[in-house]
């Protein structure tokens, strides 16, 4: 699975879109997690609504927001007010019971605001 590299400026928002096969992932919740190490578990940041039919509603954990368009097959994650510490490797996941299928790996690069120089 290829890793997508996305850049965002510190203090601004970064929008991540992960696409998937809507039929294959029908009924499955989605999640966004931080990959702290290759062998370690992916640390859950936020997941979509517990009721799948309400997955289009935005769910928030701190400054991270997730929403799922289950018909279009696109889960959108927004990292608001990007901080230096947000830089790192993440995964979009499709949840099936206790199993998690990786939809996309995302490397987030947080850049310095040139005005802070």
């Amino acid at each position: 699975l290829n890793t997508t590299v996305l850049q965002g400026m510190a203090g601004q928002s970064l929008r991540v879109s992960c696409t998937y096969d809507a039929l294959k992932h029908w009924g499955r919740r989605k999640a966004w997690c931080r990959q702290l190490g290759e062998e370690g578990p992916c640390q859950r940041v936020v997941s979509t609504h517990g009721v799948w039919l309400l997955a289009f509603l935005k769910k928030r954990n701190g400054s991270t927001v997730i929403a799922d368009d289950t018909l279009a097959g696109t889960v959108t994650i927004t990292l608001k007010n990007l901080q230096a510490g947000d830089a790192g490797l993440y995964q979009c996941q499709s949840l099936r019971g206790r199993e998690a299928e990786v939809l996309q790996k995302v490397l987030v690069e947080v850049l310095e605001d040139p005005l802070d120089d």
Epitope: Q83, G85, L89, E109
Partner: antibody, heavy 115, light 107 residues
């Protein structure tokens, strides 16, 4: 298993440029961030800066005007250049993988600044 | 920059004893704090990430906790190989910074 190896001159003259390279083996350099950290003898650790896969960099303000980092994905290497060095730059220099934290380190290379 | 203050500078203990190391941040680091162990002549080794998550392969005797801007590394029962220098490090804000270190020595 990811391994990192620093290489470069162990002795640099004052006012000259310190150049080090870190070679990454056992994994691709492309999906992570990479940092340089130094440690003067008997002292603590100082983060110098990091380079993203894209080549974008973040530097410590303490060395910002003198430092340049670059990455060569084809060789699985990243490098550090520090200009106008003085005796205060004498230290063991480490390269490390920066995946939220420094989870893999090189063994370190001692760079002495002396005429 | 965020200043991390570690205490004590030196901790003299015997094998089997409990070690408690402290790290105080000058401002909030949002749990983005790690602990490293450095043995003489070696590179540092990641022990704890995100204040309390043990890194892969780290023994269960190492644990981390936080209370606001105060962070603690606890070694429940010291083994001979645990006598080393320990550093805390934050990655909440640039520049990443380290504490000055705590040396755990044999009493």
């Amino acid at each position: 298993q990811v391994q990192l190896q620093e290489s470069g001159p162990g002795l640099v003259k004052p006012s000259e440029t310190l150049s080090l390279t870190c070679t990454v083996s056992g994994g691709s350099i492309s999906s992570y961030y990479w940092s340089w950290i130094r440690q003067p003898a008997g002292k603590g650790l100082e983060w110098i800066g990091l380079i993203y896969t894209s080549g974008s960099t973040i530097y410590n303000p303490s060395v910002k005007r003198r430092v340049t980092m670059s990455v060569d994905t084809s060789k699985n290497q990243f490098s550090l250049k520090l200009t106008s060095v003085t005796a205060a730059d004498t230290a063991v220099y480490y390269c490390a993988r920066d995946l939220f934290y420094f989870d893999y380190w090189g063994q370190g290379t001692l760079v002495t600044v002396s005429s | 920059e965020i200043v991390l203050t570690q205490s004590p500078a030196t901790l003299s203990l015997s094998p089997g004893e409990r070690a408690t190391l402290s790290c105080r941040a000058s401002q909030s680091v949002s749990s983005y704090l790690a602990w490293y162990q450095q043995r003489p002549g070696q590179a540092p080794r990641l022990l704890i990430s995100d204040a309390s998550n043990r890194a892969t392969g780290i023994p269960a005797r190492f644990s981390g906790s936080e209370s606001g801007t105060d962070f603690t590394l606890t070694i429940s029962s010291l083994e001979p190989e645990d006598f080393a220098v320990y550093y805390c490090q934050q990655r909440s804000n640039w520049p990443w910074t380290f504490g000055q270190g705590t040396k755990v020595e044999i009493k």
